[in-house]
């Protein structure tokens, strides 16, 4: 028999998800008797934060319960449940377990644009020029689907000029020129862009935007006839 | 460079209060739990309790009921308090960092110590 | 609470000899949803702090030398010093950090002969 278990949630969850089970095992009868019915309980858990009993035990079954909300990985990362299991459905032998819960990062940190806004300078007719690294804060568990981030340009580029992708390390957002600017059409573009994360906000987030103010840069061009 | 800087009051009387400050710099409390380990003279070490990066605190159920791990994140300090000691709690204290505060970094072991403060409970 | 035992308790070798030392946990450290030994391994000097060398009963902590070697997985690990030089003169510590609270090993002395 095992004496210690270990399990996993997520953060957050609501009251009646289902952790983990235990078992103990007992070789007396449980068909014509109840000595080998085994009654499981929660005999303590630490650290009591929120409170107490943030989770309950199945008496027959063992599976382990979230009872309360609350569970917050940056706040507490890990439980340790005593569990007891008794004989005779609970008026017998009583041995002992312990059950690691370990909380599991969910997406409720919203990536954040550290800074927000952006001056860059581009040399008009560059196609695939990194015009700018938009950098983001996410206190998801780094490289986790809700850590990594994704940009999308929300306005200001009109003739669809810009491109933006995420560095797979460092997650910072990418920003190059699509095809050529016309320093002669246009010197200056403004571009809003937003990020949010791969893996969908468990909860309502206010989604960051970034500003990137991008000169064009005049070019000597040839005559043409 | 990641430093932790225990400093504690060397010597207490027994049934009294032990406080311990440590203090860190290179990193942030905010991003990783701080443990308290203990060593008798002489003997091996003994796991106190963990500090995590929100504030929540898991405890060596053996010591729990005369412990108190706390921590003010703006001047990079962690305090241990300790009531009720006897000559069997004479010990290096020291403080620990995590490697990391996700399970995946390992989060249990522990990649900086300090110096240790040695206290002594004599009358 | 989980109980670590190291052995042997002390072991004397000379420069350039190959040490293993044992560390037995009294319950299996090995988490099977993610395949992971949750131990660590400490070296604690004369007179100074300990230092982690190996955790995940196998990886080598950054700075770590080559010649330190963890392995084993569920109730049984191994720290080996492939050539032992006169430095790594020090107790040395196995933790385990699978169940609270963390529990450590009573320690392996090495000495150079």
């Known amino acids: 028999t095992q004496d210690t278990f270990r399990g996993s949630v997520l953060e957050g969850v609501l009251p009646g998800t289902s952790v983990m089970q235990v078992t103990a095992t007992d070789e007396d009868d449980a068909i014509y008797t109840y000595n080998g019915v085994v009654a499981y309980s929660i005999h303590s858990q630490e650290p009591k934060d929120p409170h107490d009993l943030m989770f309950t035990i199945h008496r027959s079954t063992g599976t382990i319960s979230v009872i309360s909300s609350g569970l917050d990985r940056e706040k507490v990362p890990e439980y340790t449940l005593t569990i007891q299991a008794t004989d005779m459905d609970g008026d017998g032998s009583t041995t002992t377990a312990v059950a690691v819960v370990e909380i599991l990062d969910a997406n409720d940190n919203a990536p954040m644009f550290d800074p927000q806004k952006y001056e860059a300078h581009v040399p008009e007719n560059a196609v695939g020029h990194e015009v700018q690294r938009l950098t983001v804060t996410d206190l998801d568990a780094p490289n986790s689907p809700a850590w990594r981030a994704t940009y999308l340009i929300m306005g200001g580029d009109d003739g669809d000029h810009f491109t933006i992708t995420t560095h797979p390390e460092s997650n910072q957002g990418i920003l190059t020129t699509r095809k050529g600017l016309d320093f002669e059409a246009k010197n200056q573009h403004t571009l809003y862009v937003e990020v949010t994360n791969e893996a969908p906000f468990v909860l309502k987030l206010p989604t960051s935007t970034a500003t990137i103010v991008v000169h064009v840069e005049d070019v000597n061009e040839a005559p043409v006839f | 460079v990641q430093l932790l800087e225990e400093s504690g009051p060397g010597l207490v009387t027994p049934s009294q209060s032990l406080s311990i400050t440590c203090t860190v710099s290179?990193?942030?409390?905010?991003?990783?739990?701080i443990n308290w380990v203990r060593q008798p003279p002489g003997k091996g070490l003994e796991w106190l309790g963990v500090?995590?990066?929100?504030?929540?605190?898991n405890y060596n159920s053996a010591l729990k009921s005369r412990l108190s791990i706390t921590k003010d994140n703006s001047k990079s300090q962690v305090f241990l308090k300790m009531t009720s000691l006897q000559t069997d709690d004479t010990a290096r204290y020291y403080c620990?960092?995590?490697?990391?505060?996700?399970?995946?970094?390992?989060?249990?072991?522990?990649?900086?110590w300090g110096q240790g403060t040695t206290v002594t409970v004599s009358s | 609470e989980l109980v670590m035992t190291q052995s042997p308790s002390s072991l004397a070798v000379s420069v350039g000899e190959k040490v293993t030392m044992s560390c037995k946990s009294s319950?299996?450290?090995?988490?099977?949803?993610?395949?992971?030994?949750?131990l660590a391994w400490y070296q604690q000097k004369p007179g100074q702090s300990p230092k982690l060398l190996i955790y995940?009963?196998?990886t080598r902590e950054s700075g770590v030398p080559d010649r330190f070697t963890g392995s084993g997985s569920g109730t049984d690990f191994t720290l080996t010093i492939s050539s032992v030089k006169a430095e790594d003169l020090a107790v040395y510590y196995c933790?385990?950090?699978?169940?609270?609270?963390?529990?450590f090993g009573g320690g392996t002395k090495l000495e150079i002969k």
């Open positions: 620990a960092k995590s490697r990391g505060v996700y399970d995946f970094d390992g989060r249990g072991a522990m990649d900086y």
């Open positions: 290179g990193f942030s409390l905010t991003s990783y739990p």
């Open positions: 500090i995590w990066t929100g504030g929540g605190t």
């Open positions: 319950q299996s450290l090995l988490y099977s949803s993610n395949q992971k030994n949750y």
């Open positions: 995940w009963a196998s």
């Open positions: 933790q385990q950090y699978y169940s609270y609270p963390y529990t």
